[in-house]
Interface confidence: low
């Protein structure tokens, strides 16, 4: 069983490496756009057990203008250069299957994703009206501040809902 071609997302492209069941692919925002905070670029080929038909999950991805380019004056056509967009490796959470929102990077700086430090998991408190999620941080080598190892840290949403792309603890993106 395989999935059909995935849906299109405005201002984004996807290069599918595998259409097989349970494969995960990532949309990449086009040059000049970046992923909106709180949206997920991940899609997964899943099986609808009722119909036995495979389909791609709907990504919550929203690509918005790159803030660095919003106020820049366009260069003459002969001198325009576009930074290549490359997928960024995923940061992993301790367990589970759901994707946590992550992103490609379209910076010119060398961006890397640091692995989780074993044993650094925080135990967040959970209240009925507050969604709590444990989030792994990404790191980037960009001068100051210094490059360090990422560690899990707890963020608590003060809103009564979680933004799209933020998933409850115990879920992770394992790609």
């Amino acid at each position: 069983i395989t999935c059909p071609p995935p849906m299109s997302v405005e201002h984004a492209d996807i290069w599918v490496k595998s259409y097989s069941l349970y494969s995960r692919e990532r949309y990449i925002c086009n040059s000049g756009f970046k992923r909106k905070a709180g949206t997920s670029s991940l899609t997964e080929c899943v099986l609808n057990k009722a119909t036995n038909v495979a389909h791609w999950t709907t990504p919550s991805l929203k690509c918005i203008r790159d803030p660095a380019l919003v106020h820049q004056r366009p260069a003459p056509p002969s001198t325009v250069t576009t930074a290549g967009v490359t997928p960024q490796p995923e940061s992993l959470s301790p367990s589970g299957k759901e994707p946590a929102a992550s992103s490609p990077s379209s910076n010119n700086t060398a961006a890397t994703t640091a692995a989780i430090v074993p044993g650094s998991q925080l135990m967040p408190s959970k209240s009925p009206s507050t969604g709590t999620t444990e989030i792994s941080s990404h790191e980037s080598s960009h001068g100051t501040p210094s490059q360090t190892t990422a560690k899990n840290w707890e963020l608590t949403a003060s809103a009564s809902h979680q933004p799209p792309g933020v998933y409850p603890q115990g879920h992770s993106d394992t790609t």
Partner: nanobody, 124 residues
Framework: EVQLVESGGGLVQAGGSLRLSCAAS????????IGWFRQAPGKEREGVSC????????YYAGSVKGRFTISSDNAKNMVYLQMNSLKVEDTAVYYC?????????????????WGQGTQVTVSS
């Protein structure tokens, strides 16, 4: 040009308060999430707080929850971090950054913009 300029740091006694400010320019403020990170000498960079302007959601690291409050003034393109009940371990350089609240891209990755930092020193 994207610019983030922090201010408001200083020396304060344990239990005291400070209010950090971040003046943002060069991008459409309410399209992005902005937050605060800190780094103490010889320690790992640590996320402090984040605000997703799309829906007003705010996030806090467990170590500062209940003591720190993030807020913004979209009209002025300003983000604030009110820090109460400060502890010696809060001593660090605090950076304002465009980031992603969902995965917390610490000063890099998706959005690679941050300020020059402001020093906060809490004495006992």
């Amino acid at each position: 040009e994207v610019q983030l300029v922090e201010s408001g740091g200083g020396l304060v006694q344990a239990g005291g308060s400070l209010r950090l400010s971040c003046a943002a320019s060069g991008f459409t403020f309410d399209d992005y999430a902005i937050g605060w990170f800190r780094q103490a000498p010889g320690k790992e960079r640590e996320g402090v707080s984040c605000m997703d302007s799309s829906d007003g959601s705010t996030y806090y690291a467990g170590s500062v929850k209940g003591r720190f409050t993030i807020s913004s003034d979209n009209a002025k393109n300003m983000v604030y971090l009110q820090m109460n009940s400060l502890k010696v371990e809060d001593t660090a350089v605090y950076y304002c950054a465009i980031l992603d609240c969902a995965v917390v891209t610490t000063l890099g990755g998706e959005y690679d913009y941050w300020g020059q930092g402001t020093q906060v020193t809490v004495s006992s």
